[in-house]
């Protein structure tokens, strides 16, 4: 038994960081394969990881991490029972995907204005709380043409748009997405879609 | 929000021990180590210890070490200082800080009092 | 203990930057982050400054940190009366145990 493609981990940055990696050949990693992680920090203690399959030969272990900050740096070792597989490190820090911002809503009651609001995914204690920005995704479910980003770089969780620069009469579905600069993350997840039915009074024309 | 409340002030005599308690709430106790530092009059902050109150698991400073022992109760989020054969120079503002490399949360501090 | 050096005094007017050093030999700034902390008359301190350069939420940006080989500086821009108060720097080290050494102290004044 050896491993195909090494562990890549990736961290929210909160509490939980996801390890990836491929063996070289059909798995059972539930039952066949441990993964041991430790903080490299005083009085730590060592963590035991389950993994999951993800595919026939890939492996995919969620670790649980308490107060994750940038100074942090944990040993990894993939081991097959008794036999050391793989040894490695991993630093939460510059391997950030953030979590994916929820509660996506569309107000559609400010006239000719759509306001779009979500929630930030971190606490107020977490650095990340104040170094998101968003796009914002939204497209016509009845023109795969009719798809639009919107950056949003200021720290509210919101974004204002006219519903006239929409079309009239038809439903659209919105999603957002997070990334950080200050860590250089990837981007989230896309959140869950909302969908509304977008309609405004077109102004008279003469 | 993140409170540390801390035990009230204490008056003892040279020899003798005693014991500050700091208990912790509005956050998970278990996930977060608990530093120890004090303050003796007009002076600076020094660092006393750090307790994982996952495992209860302790590191001292070497000046402390024999002296001083931190423990904690997980049932009511409370970590512990006990400081024995106090001398008049342990005479200090006592604080609880939470944090793993640096301190974000402060108690109010417990002035300890060593005096014949 | 390590010890970290700080000036034991700076003073400035109203509106004024001033910056206060903070200076390690050995290990501990050099292969560390450091933090700085607030203590107002009379209260316990509290974190200003974190990962060299980073503020806690509720922190004005007027307060801001960088480090530099073995030493470190916490610098406050636009200074209100309410700024007086004694600054600590703080780090960790690990050699060759882990320790905490916190700065000698700054006392701020201003005029």
């Known amino acids: 038994m050896k491993v195909l493609q090494e562990p890549t981990c990736v961290s929210d940055y909160m509490s939980i960081s996801t390890c990836e990696w491929k063996m070289n050949g059909p798995t059972n990693c539930s039952t066949e394969l441990r993964l041991l992680y430790q903080l490299v920090f005083l009085l730590s203690e060592a963590h035991t990881c389950i993994p999951e399959n993800n595919g026939g030969a890939g492996c995919v272990c969620h670790l649980l991490m308490d107060d994750v900050v940038s100074a942090d740096n944990y040993t990894l070792d993939l081991w097959a029972g008794q036999q050391l597989l793989w040894k490695g490190s991993f630093k939460p820090s510059e391997h950030v995907k953030p979590r994916a911002p929820g509660n996506l809503t569309v107000h559609t009651n400010v006239s000719d204005t759509l306001l779009l609001t979500w929630s930030n995914p971190y606490p107020p204690d977490n650095y990340l709380y104040n170094h998101l920005t968003y796009a914002v995704n939204i497209w016509s479910e009845n023109d795969p043409a009719d798809f639009r980003i919107y950056n949003v770089t200021y720290l509210e969780p919101s974004l204002r748009i006219a519903a006239s620069t929409l079309k009239s009469g038809i439903s659209y579905r919105a999603r957002v997405r997070a990334w950080a600069q200050c860590y250089n993350t990837t981007w989230s997840e896309w959140s869950p879609s909302t969908k509304w039915h977008n309609s405004y009074r077109e102004p008279f024309e003469q | 929000q993140v409170q540390l409340v801390q035990s009230g002030a204490e008056v003892k005599k040279p020899g003798a021990s005693v014991k500050v308690s700091c208990k912790a709430s509005?956050?998970?106790?278990?996930?977060?180590?608990m530093h120890w530092a004090r303050q003796a009059p007009g002076q600076g902050l020094e660092w006393m210890g750090i307790?994982?109150?996952?495992?209860?698991?302790?590191s001292y400073a070497q000046k402390f070490q024999g002296r001083v022992a931190m423990t904690r109760d997980t049932s009511t989020s409370t970590v512990y200082m006990e400081l024995s054969s106090l001398r008049p120079e342990d005479t200090a503002v006592y604080y609880c800080?939470?944090?793993?490399?640096?301190?974000?949360?402060w108690g109010k501090g417990t002035l300890v009092t060593v005096s014949s | 203990q390590s010890v970290l050096t700080q000036p034991p005094s700076v003073s400035a007017a109203p509106g004024q930057k001033v910056t206060i050093s903070c200076s390690g030999g050995?290990?501990?700034?050099?292969?560390?982050?450091v933090s700085w902390y607030q203590q107002l008359p009379g209260t316990a301190p509290k974190l200003l400054i974190y990962?060299?350069?980073k503020r806690p939420s509720g922190v004005p940006d007027r307060f801001s940190g960088s480090k530099s080989g073995t030493s470190a500086t916490l610098a406050i821009t636009g200074l209100q009366t309410g700024d007086e108060a004694d600054y600590y720097c703080?780090?960790?080290?690990?050699?060759?145990?882990?320790?905490?050494?916190f700065g000698t102290g700054t006392k701020l004044t201003v005029l």
């Open positions: 800080a939470r944090g793993k490399y640096w301190m974000y949360d």
């Open positions: 509005g956050y998970a106790f278990t996930s977060y180590y």
């Open positions: 307790i994982n109150p996952r495992g209860g698991s302790t």
């Open positions: 050995g290990s501990s700034i050099g292969n560390s982050y």
């Open positions: 990962d060299n350069n």
């Open positions: 703080g780090t960790w080290d690990t050699s060759p145990v882990w320790e905490w050494p």
